[in-house]
Amino acid sequence: MPLLLLLPLLWAGALAMDPNFWLQVQESVTVQEGLCVLVPCTFFHPIPYYDKNSPVHGYWFREGAIISRDSPVATNKLDQEVQEETQGRFRLLGDPSRNNCSLSIVDARRRDNGSYFFRMERGSTKYSYKSPQLSVHVTDLTHRPKILIPGTLEPGHSKNLTCSVSWACEQGTPPIFSWLSAAPTSLGPRTTHSSVLIITPRPQDHGTNLTCQVKFAGAGVTTERTIQLNVTYVPQNPTTGIFPGDGSGKQETRAGVVHGAIGGAGVTALLALCLCLIFFIVKTHRRKAARTAVGRNDTHPTTGSASPKHQKKSKLHGPTETSSCSGAAPTVEMDEELHYASLNFHGMNPSKDTSTEYSEVRTQ
């Protein structure tokens, strides 16, 4: 004799008006806007012998629906119309012929808030389970994308930055990824839940914002993560850092992937300026300044990439008069000084007169 399931009759809240018709489903489910949820559901219905071989049709209705007039939000009956606003998003994932009424909701929207009840039909046997009902709560999307930077960002070296939304569900509408950066970038491959940005940073990109924006078009909701670029020359072994964005600068709404286009002359001038500044620092501070830099990780760490929390912008203060930058070969003393100070650009800010051109590219 097959295993008989009578225990569900004892489940709290599972009894409808007729104890031989019972349904078990959680009475409340919460889902973030744009995301998805699968609500397990089991039901039982006595089947008179004359309906034994009839197909089982299941329906989920919004609370207050009139069966003869209103369309369900989801059903397994192929020729049955469903509510336009839930079409393709609400799905009766369970097989009612196996007593499974599980409901799948993808691309959750605010207007999905409310209570829903299940109905079964098998031949002439029809029953609406008015208790328990499923209450759906759609809340703000609080999840944020993660930006993964493998190793250290060095000037002139291309790196693949990955923006991922591992918390998004496979069944939903694939999100649209948008990147914003002033640094020279191009788009790499993307998967359902991640996008790759190929970035070739310049010294002046240090401290600038990079934003990954993810739009869940199915629900019309957007989330983003902004980090500050840490561009440094590090000859040591690279490390991998994940920037979750806590305290890494203000969140900004950006429209797309931005490529910074800077004229070649501007780049040359900027590099010359950098060399001048280095030369001036070396001359002024000598070893004392270098040793101080080594000992203060919170301002100018000489190795590795600082976490965004500990980054502080240091302005380089030089004399008002112009220093001589003739491009002569560095002296041994300068080499030695540079060895201590290391070539890092923590204190560098993009020149104010540098014109940055923004262009938009989206990955879909």
């Epitope: 031989n20 008179p48 046997t125």
Partner: antibody, heavy 129, light 107 residues
Framework: QVQLVQSGAEVKKPGASVKVSCKAS????????INWVRQAPGQGLEWMGW????????DSAQKFQGRVTMTRDTSTSTVYMELSSLRSEDTAVYYC??????????????????????WGQGTTVTVSS | DIQMTQSPSSLSASVGDRVTITCQAS??????LNWYQQKPGKAPKLLIY???TLQSGVPSRFSGSGSGTDFTLTISSLQPEDFATYYC?????????FGQGTKLEIK
Amino acid sequence: QVQLVQSGAEVKKPGASVKVSCKASGGTFSNYAINWVRQAPGQGLEWMGWINPNSGGTDSAQKFQGRVTMTRDTSTSTVYMELSSLRSEDTAVYYCARDSSLALSYGGNSEYYYGMDVWGQGTTVTVSS
Amino acid sequence: DIQMTQSPSSLSASVGDRVTITCQASQDISDHLNWYQQKPGKAPKLLIYGASTLQSGVPSRFSGSGSGTDFTLTISSLQPEDFATYYCQQAYSFPWTFGQGTKLEIK
């Protein structure tokens, strides 16, 4: 909990017809077959037939075909059994009983177990000249 | 039609006794067999369905077993309220048919 309440006792002459009612209260009426079972004095139980309260469809034992008519009134949750061309051997207590599939196994091959779990109190029909 | 045969037709026993009633089907009915209890002047009451599953509210001293053509109803320890007539019924194919009944009397 559902209850089945039947009409009162009847005395009929041979050749006449009798119509017994069975009213459901306190539960779902339409989703269960309603059976009619009779029991002659001192005898065992004899199944007569069933009615589908939703569609009005019926089936009856061959012995009663052509003589028994089962109908329903969904507005009052009542089913009726009419037996015509009465004979003395039709003297019996007539019961209506709800037939439910009482259990189900999980899996693709579901097994149903039918049993008459709710009965009316019975209606005595006496056929006498 | 499937014929159902019960034995014995009547049985005398005392309170506390263990009683067994058997039912035989004229063909294989798997486990689609029900047992009913009927007291004088009352409607039958479903005790067991599916050959061995106790209906809700029925005392556990009642048990059923069997499959195919041979079935048994057992009352482990007779109580005064158990003296009644017991019927088996096949619910395998139409028409539903009953056994002729077993009358359980006080010895």
